[in-house]
Interface confidence: medium
């Protein structure tokens, strides 16, 4: 004999796969004080339930392990706890109260669960800015995991150096310590929930701080091809008159401040231009001599700088004795 | 290309019933639940119940149990809803919408809407 | 039941401006909120769900973030076209409810 009762509170309730879910059920208050019995949980049309308390009473594989009761007669409590959801446990639910001593049981309204797709993604902090040679902790953290499921399995992955840092059931800390062919590169955190069989990750692309590591100078003479000095040059000859077009490039990130200066500058020289650009329409007499690029960053400085040898054409020269 | 269609306008007498329809296509029928959403003129929406069409399961809100009941024909790939004992109150209109049961998202279907009115 | 409250009936914005369209849960809802777009004479527009899974095709000026019970849908860089009623929903337990509605007018 059987005694229907209705459970309190929502008939369906929505997880997302691998997460955790409370079935919530109080038993009724009609249930005498002296009722002694145990519980179980059935998924809608089995006989064998999902989760007792019955020590004699087996349980179902698939579920054994992840579908806990958590009875507490006292208080009425006869809530399931869903942990590791899959795909399969989508379904109804139903609970049933059944004694050994008593003539009749009771048994629950039934309850959907619906298991949705994981959309949840890792998120990945950062504390600062990534400077290279300078060790950073990152975290990728999961906060919309339950404490009480699998703990998930966390993996990074960059082609930065790295090692790995604590970790929580929530998080996982990596210690990068980035070089500059490091920035702009993808770092990939992975999480998988071994409960569920699900796998999820977070991709960003790392922003890399560094000084300049290389500098160099094209020049641009006249009609003809460009050319590039990548070291300290100790002579470029020119020919008087040439119009002369100096570009500066160098790397670093953020980008460094380019400048020209005529000579050896000291630190605090005042530039000749304040770009990467200089123009020198008409060599002569007065352009003869050094001129320095200087990339300046706030994590370093580098220079290039080239010799001008001024070639002074025969009938100028005549002209001038 | 999905689409729910539903049926047109309805104009109904006070303690009447009536039948609105919601026939989908462009995606497999019985892989998504059937919701039903009320909308009272310049007013929020309400969530009527829904429908597994693979087993014809329901699940209503308690202020509709008595006033919709929730069927499919999955034959024809449609999906009912009947209202009854009509009041003035039940003028509104009702849209059927998807949702993928195991899937990435919620309601992401919406059918065009049917008008009710009820008037004597 | 789980009421949902929009505390806004009226938002006002201009195009290119940032909005932020917020909801509140009476009870925690585990990030089970999806956000809708109704324009006028339109069936209702799924844009957000799992309070930030942005739909397929959808912007990516509308961003959703919350947990809990306080949830906020965000439009940047406004467009004339998003003019419309914003609601939010929670997916977390039956019945599913959604709050009253928020208006967004263009300036």
């Known amino acids: 004999q059987e005694r229907r009762f209705q459970l309190e509170g929502p008939e369906s309730l929505t997880v997302q796969e691998g997460l955790c879910v409370l079935v919530p059920c109080r038993l009724p208050t009609t249930l005498p004080a002296s009722y002694y019995g145990y519980g179980y949980w059935f998924l809608e049309g089995a006989d064998v339930p999902v989760a007792t308390n019955d020590p004699d009473e087996e349980v179902q594989e698939e579920t054994r392990g992840r579908f806990h009761l958590l009875w507490d007669p006292r208080r009425k409590n006869c809530s399931l706890s869903i942990r590791d959801a899959r795909r399969r446990d989508n379904a109804a639910y139903f609970f049933r109260l059944k004694s050994k001593w008593m003539k009749y049981g009771y048994t629950s309204s039934k309850l959907s669960v619906r298991v949705m797709a994981l959309t949840h993604r890792p998120n990945i902090s950062i504390p600062g800015t990534l400077e290279s040679g300078h060790p950073s902790n990152l975290t990728c953290s999961v906060p919309w995991v339950c404490e009480q499921g699998t703990p998930p399995i966390f993996s990074w992955m960059s082609a930065a150096p790295t090692s790995l840092g604590p970790r929580t059931t929530q998080s996982s800390v990596l210690t990068i310590t980035p070089r500059p062919q490091d920035h702009s590169t993808n770092l990939t955190c992975q999480v998988t929930f071994p409960g569920a069989g699900v796998t999820m990750e977070r991709t960003i692309q790392l922003n890399v701080s560094y000084a300049p590591q290389k500098v160099a100078i094209s020049i641009f003479q006249g009609n003809s091809a460009a050319f590039k000095i990548l070291q300290n040059t100790s002579s470029l000859p020119v020919l008087e008159g040439q119009a002369l077009r100096l570009l500066c490039d160098a790397d670093g990130n953020p980008p460094a401040h380019l400048s020209w200066f005529q000579g050896f500058p000291a630190l605090n020289a005042t530039p000749i231009s304040n770009t990467g650009v200089l123009e020198l329409p008409q060599v002569g007499s007065a352009e003869e001599g050094d001129f320095t690029c200087r990339a300046q960053h706030p994590l370093g400085s580098l220079q290039i700088s080239l010799s001008l040898f001024v070639h002074w054409k025969p009938e100028g020269r005549a002209g001038g004795v | 290309e999905v689409q729910l269609q539903q049926s047109g306008p309805e104009l109904m007498k006070p303690g009447a019933s009536v039948k609105i329809s919601c026939k989908a296509s462009?995606?497999?029928?019985?892989?998504?639940?059937m919701n039903w959403v009320k909308q009272s003129h310049g007013k929020s929406l309400e969530w009527i119940g829904d429908?597994?069409?693979?087993?014809?399961?329901?699940i209503y809100n308690q202020k509709f149990k008595g006033k919709a009941t929730l069927t499919v024909d999955k034959s024809s790939s449609t999906a009912y809803m009947e209202l009854r004992s009509l009041t003035s109150e039940d003028s509104a209109v009702y849209y059927c919408?998807?949702?993928?049961?195991?899937?990435?998202?919620?309601?992401?279907?919406w059918g065009q809407g049917t008008t009710l009115t009820v008037s004597s | 039941d789980i009421v949902m409250t929009q505390s806004h009936k009226f938002m006002s914005t201009s195009v290119g401006d940032r909005v932020s369209i917020t909801c509140k849960a009476s009870?925690?809802?585990?990030?089970?909120v999806a956000w809708y777009q109704q324009k006028p004479g339109q069936s209702p527009k799924l844009l957000i769900y799992?309070?930030?899974t942005r739909h397929t095709g959808v912007p990516d000026r509308f961003t959703g973030t919350g947990s809990g019970t306080d949830y906020t849908l965000t439009i940047s860089n406004v467009q004339a076209e998003d003019l419309a009623l914003y609601y939010c929903?929670?997916?977390?337990?039956?019945?599913?409810?959604f709050g009253g509605g928020t208006k967004l007018e263009i300036k």
């Open positions: 462009g995606y497999t029928f019985t892989d998504y639940y």
């Open positions: 009870q925690d809802v585990t990030t089970a």
């Open positions: 429908i597994n069409p693979k087993i014809g399961d329901t």
């Open positions: 799992w309070a930030s």
């Open positions: 919408a998807r949702w993928d049961y195991y899937g990435s998202s919620l309601f992401d279907y």
């Open positions: 929903q929670q997916h977390y337990s039956t019945p599913y409810t």
